[in-house]
Amino acid sequence: ANSMLEETKQGNLERECIEELCNKEEAREVFENDPETDYFYPKYLVCLRSFQSGLFTAARQSTDAYPDLRSCVNAIPDQCSPLPCNEDGYMSCKDGKASFTCTCKPGWQGEKCEFDINECKDPSNINGGCSQICDNTPGSYHCSCKSGFVMLSNKKDCKDVDECSLKPNMCGTAVCKNIPGDFECECPEGYRYNLKSKSCEDVDECSENMCAQLCVNYPGGYTCYCDGKKGFKLAQDQKSCEAVSVCLPLNLDTKYELLYLAEQFAGVVLYLKFRLPEISRFSAEFDFRTYDSQGVILYAESIDHSAWLLIALRGGKIEVQLKNEHTSKITTGGDIINNGLWNMVSVEELEHSISIKIAKEAVMDINKPGPLFKPENGLLETKVYFAGFPRKVESELIKPINPRLDGCIRSWNLMKQGASGIKEIIQEKQNKHCLVTVEKGSYYPGSGIAEFHIDYNNGSNAEGWHINVTLNIRPSMGTGVMLALVSSNNTVPFAVSLVDSTSEKSQDIVISVENTVIYRIQALSLCSNQRSHLEFRVNRNNLELLTPLKIETISQEELQTQLAILDKAMKGKVATYLGGLPDVPFSATPVNAFYNGCMEVNINGVELDLDEAISKHNDIRAHSCPSVWKKTKNS
């Protein structure tokens, strides 16, 4: 019915307005409504103006599409001509009464389908239904994936690519690890992946200044070391260094009036020369204190070395040896005086004898024919040496003696000349001053070592070598090497050290083979007035701790590996060091600080006497130990 109406309207329009000209009222009769008439008539006038003979106005431009007046006028009522809709976005155009309706393709909107719908922003379909990236396009959209993901066939979802399974040797010698959207070539800790060589390369952490002092790089890691010999130890962070702190303060007060006899490990502590009238006789008075059992107190001789007198200690008793043109004698007597107390000693040459007194009581009288030292040119010239010999005199002695003596003398009066300027000399030299109070024992000041050559091989023992050690210690610093065996190739196949424990105010004892800790005796309160006792036995098969303490050890298998290293070293030459290490690499042992404190060592049943050492640092006290600092009310 509608199409019939349209055809009638078209016929009327043809008759009324094309075959003849029509005014607006006549046009109203054709359309039968105002909106269409109002839309049609202005456009009709434009067509008339354009196609009137000889008339070409600017209006003609808008009617260029039509070849004649009929076409121009017929097109006016069709709202879809010319097309008002956006060509990209419309599906169809429907003509209406002075209006049109554009039907849009999916993905377009607006009256003329001129606006693209952004499907990616559709609240009812979040992100366009895409699992990763939504790309809006004119009239449409599509999903895409981030790199490292591939699109699934539903064109919406993405799947991670497992690059590691795509190419098995993707990372070369490294381990390929798939991660969302990517992959990683993983190396063990301490290694870094090299993209060029496709391999894991050792990270040189030492070149990255990881350590405060010393650094040793090894494949897959590094170890920091601190210069223990300068008093540093590794901090908790295993990187920085901190000073080895005092855990038990000692009374290190000295007095210049007290002459220390063991200032030199080998050598004379003081040398005096006397030129006196020929009537003078030899005399020496002094107070003497020691725990040492053997050593030279003083040695006096004539200028030409032909006559000499030795005052010494042997077995804790005074011994006198003398030799001159008339006689050669040796006498030992009196009570044991190496008791750590001050003993007044006097040696006086009388007319026919030499008198030795302790605490003013005569203990020895040695007969002598004639003077001890022969005067020359009316003068008695005598040289006196304290705590040692001026040269090698072993062959001249009646009975050999180890000259080293750890002791003190005070209030001396030689040749009846009083202190005669000696105090002034001593006053200037701090290391000649003696400690005010001492106890029995050996003292390691944390600045040196003592070396021994001990034969650990026992022919009668089927095990071959064995080491039985007893340590009595009273440390004053919580870290240091107490005992170490050092091979000729500068390795340390065995060491017993002290380290500050992680738990406060306690120490661990570590036993190591080279740089591996094989035993750790944990959390002991060693820094106390009381001495601590540690006893152990080692042979090629076993390490046995005889002191009942809580230990932490490595596996039996690993222990055997480490004991095999020790066994190999013990078959060669090893030197025994007390109190620290000689110049070995820092990485040779877990601990390299010097031991600071008191310590007595017994190895294979023999108490080690530091006076018998091959070498000993001068500051190590062989037979005296400073007492613990006692806090006074005003200190």
Epitope: H142, S144, C145, K146, S147, G148, F149, V150, M151, L152, S153, N154, K155, D157, C158, K159, V161, E163, L166, K167, M170
Partner: antibody
Amino acid sequence: QVQLQESGPGLVKPSETLSLTCTVSGGSISNYYWNWIRQPPGKGLEWIGYIYYIGITDYNPSLKSRVTISVDTSKNQFSLKVTSVTAADTAVYYCAALSGDHAFDIWGQGTLVTVSS
Amino acid sequence: DIVMTQTPLSSPVTLGQPASISCRSSQSLVHSDGNTYLSWLQQRPGQPPRLLIYKISNRFSGVPDRFSGSGAGTDFTLKISRVEAEDVGVYYCMQATQFPHLTFGGGTKVEIK
């Protein structure tokens, strides 16, 4: 949407190298595994090989010694080279996109390569 | 490599009637991730192949619902419920379980009687 277009010479002389390029448009080259497949006249489909955009490749063992597939991400293209060709290499060569579901979602129109002197 | 065998080689069908194509693999196509990567492709005369079905039974976008896939392990089937003239062509099954090594079946030709 993603479209593929093969290009390259239609005629190659025996013993020479066949070179084809596939241009990817309308999407990211990182979103699929890119494959070459061939079909000799009147015969079935034969998978040649694939490339992933970071350069990972794999080839049909029967062709491995003669085939190289490469990618140029800046141009959104991947290429096929077959060396020492013979008449047996005459075929329609297709490039195709393999999805994460391991299915060939998208195909190029194909290009006929004839090996003849 | 996995060998894919299709039967029949040719399948003449009457328009509006169903058709069935079988595909057998030389070993199980179940991947370690649990999926079975078996797909079906259609190649109309003079055209490139196009994806119909992926992962045994999933219809690809735009594929009419008269096409369906089924099967498991080593035996798979493509069914066309009512064959239309536009369905004429060669149908291929393809395994991608062994990805990146892919193999196609020999093809089955569907023609109208």
